[in-house]
């Protein structure tokens, strides 16, 4: 059975390039150790944006110099991606692994939306 | 460009061991899941066992299950099949096939031949 | 386990015409998890279609996928003589990963 993931059409950044957003799946089994990916697919190429593989009930951990923090609640992981830009707008998709134990399971989210607004410069004040 | 180059292939005798090797290049080998896939002589394509990324889980066919073992080595950008107590029915080209991003094999080696027989 | 089983066999067309190939699982397998792969003679296998629809970088608009849940078509719009070769379909959504027996697509 195919595992389904399930994530925001659209997310905007916030002005200082923060955008959130949640992805669920739904387990067709009990696994233990789950491995999230973000992916950014622009022009049918598809690059990891960052990676994140957390043992059930503990906590989400990213790597130091990733720009993807997160926290996970049973099925559910609540993603934040930092330092988006206007370049950075395009379709970032949930990827769930379901690594341990077997079976392996694959879940590819619709993807999300992200739309980045660049914040206009101050005016310079005399 | 993204290469996969399969090499250890051979003939080789009922009972006996082989160690298959890939060596990858033109991508960030220790980012992609990998596996094995094998085809009998004019038959179909057969998967034989997968490695995450990190080398942290495997999974393997029933037909191979005890016999063979996946392994890898980021440091070397290299993918290994050891497989035991090879049979006649194991004889095969074998290939490593990438893990795409969403999934699918996405490149694939030329294949390495293996031949068990007395 | 998901059993793919791929329709017909063996199709004999002429260059030109039109192929469609199909493929059905045992179990439902989501669309996402569907692929297609084509291999000639002496060559390694060439993934054609991700997804069920979604064509692999570099493959002709000749080439689309189509269906979902348990019933999946491969069409070749039209034929060109590089096409015929042995076409593979493959779930990859679990374990175990499996892949349909094949449809050979030979000229007539």
């Known amino acids: 059975k195919a595992m389904h993931v399930a994530q925001p059409a659209v997310v905007l950044a916030s002005s200082r390039g923060i955008a959130s957003f949640v992805c669920e799946y739904a387990s067709p089994g009990k696994a233990t150790e789950v491995r999230v990916t973000v992916l950014r697919q622009a022009d049918s190429q598809v690059t990891e944006v960052c990676a994140a593989t957390y043992m059930m009930g503990n906590e989400l951990t990213f790597l130091d110099d990733s720009i993807c923090t997160g926290t996970s609640s049973g099925n559910q992981v609540n993603l934040t991606i930092q330092g988006l830009r206007a370049m950075d707008t395009g379709l970032y998709i949930c990827k769930v692994e379901l690594m341990y134990p077997p079976p392996y399971y694959l879940g590819i989210g619709n993807g999300t939306q992200i739309y980045v607004i660049d914040p206009e410069p101050c005016p310079d004040s005399d | 460009q993204v290469q996969l180059v399969e090499s250890g292939g051979g003939v080789v005798q009922p009972g006996r061991s082989l160690r298959l090797s890939c060596a990858a290049s033109g991508f960030t080998f220790s980012s992609y899941h990998m596996h094995w896939v094998r085809q009998a002589p004019g038959k179909g394509l057969e998967w034989v066992t997968f490695?995450?990324?990190?080398?942290?889980?495997?999974y393997y066919a029933d037909s191979v299950k005890g016999r063979f073992t996946i392994s890898r080595d980021n440091s070397k950008n290299t993918l290994y099949l050891q497989m035991n107590s090879l049979r006649a029915e194991d004889t095969a080209i074998y290939y490593c096939?990438?893990?795409?991003?969403?999934?699918?094999?996405?490149?694939w080696g030329q294949g390495t031949l293996v031949t068990v027989s007395s | 386990e998901i059993v793919l089983t791929q329709s017909p066999g063996t199709l004999s067309l002429s260059p030109g015409e039109r192929a469609t190939l199909s493929c059905r699982a045992s179990?439902?397998?989501?669309?996402?998890?569907l692929a297609w792969y084509q291999q000639k003679p002496g060559q390694a296998p060439r993934l054609l279609i991700y997804g069920a629809f979604s064509r692999a970088t570099g493959i002709p608009d000749r080439f689309s996928g189509s269906g979902s849940g348990t019933d999946f078509t491969l069409t070749i719009s039209r034929l060109e003589p590089e096409d015929f070769a042995v076409y593979y379909c493959q779930q990859y959504g679990s374990s175990p990963w499996t892949f349909g027996q094949g449809t050979k697509v030979e000229i007539k």
């Open positions: 490695i995450s990324y990190d080398g942290n889980n495997k």
């Open positions: 096939a990438r893990t795409g991003w969403l999934g699918p094999f996405d490149y």
């Open positions: 179990q439902s397998v989501g669309s996402s998890y």
